[in-house]
């Protein structure tokens, strides 16, 4: 039996930050679980991990080069990615493992979310014309 995951098909990070919500067909309340976010078509880079345990507060691991935090809902984990770079535009996949109670469960591969990171563009300073000549 596999957990199903729903993600937005695409998100745009205008201010170099984005909230990606992973919605699961499973209630995480009172479970020991590991939710993770993976970058790339082959999911080769694990960007962020959120670990939940009924007996302690949420723990978050963020890979070097990514500023990440997580928030838990009953059937969702939202990843908050900040300080993203334009070259981190890619497809990101949500994964979930439930370790306790048995049986161990994980998810069917989701369709992923394309995160498009828009670069910050500095606005040109307004031109102040000099004093007009009489």
């Amino acid at each position: 039996n596999k957990i199903l995951v729903k993600q937005s098909p695409m998100l745009v990070a205008y201010d170099n930050a984005v909230n990606l919500s992973c919605k699961y067909s499973y209630n995480l309340f009172s479970r020991e679980f590991r939710a993770s976010l993976h970058k790339g078509l082959d999911s080769a880079v694990e960007v962020c991990v959120v670990y939940g345990n009924y007996s302690q507060q949420l723990q978050v691991y963020s890979k070097t080069g990514f500023n990440c935090d997580g928030k838990l809902g009953n059937e969702s984990v939202t990843f908050y990615l900040q300080n993203l770079y334009v070259n981190q535009t890619d497809i990101y996949f949500c994964k979930i493992e439930v370790m306790y109670p048995p049986p161990y469960l994980d998810n069917e591969k989701s369709n992923g979310t394309i995160i498009h990171v828009k670069g910050k563009h500095l606005c040109p300073s307004p031109l102040f014309p000099g004093p007009s000549k009489p």
């Epitope: 993976h38 082959d42 999911s43 991990v49 670990y51 691991y61 493992e97 370790m99 994980d106």
Partner: nanobody, 125 residues
């Protein structure tokens, strides 16, 4: 900070044995999957073996099955790789890796969160 330190590498003749150790510090080791990878000169890092949190479940790459055995001692925060019937093609730098808060026997290097510095294993013919 999490640290992984490998030891036990060295030079051995073909057919010989070595036991690698990887000591971890900086976290509660018993909630993590541990893995061994290796990298030969000019080649990509490849998966060798992994062990789950309890030590009851293991996974191996095909070329080492029946020759290598991974184990762990959660009281000592240490994972081991017993390597028997070594072959010249086992020559590589061996790395241990830690996958946080998991029970999934991952085989991709990108699915591991922390790495040791590696220990050299050389098998002479």
């Amino acid at each position: 900070e999490v640290q992984l330190v490998e030891s036990g590498g060295g030079l051995v003749q073909a057919g010989g044995s070595l036991r690698l150790s990887c000591a971890t510090s900086g976290r509660t080791f018993s909630s993590d999957v541990m893995g061994w990878f290796r990298q030969a000169p000019g080649k990509e890092r490849e998966f060798v073996a992994a062990i789950n949190r309890s030590g009851h479940s293991t996974s191996y790459t095909g070329s080492v099955k029946g020759r290598f055995a991974i184990s762990r001692d959660n009281t000592k925060n240490t994972v081991y790789l017993q390597m028997n019937s070594l072959k010249p093609e086992d020559t590589a730098v061996y790395y241990c890796a830690l996958r946080l808060w998991s029970d999934y026997l991952a085989q991709k290097s990108g699915e591991y969160n922390y790495w040791g510095q590696g220990t050299q294993v050389t098998v002479s013919s």
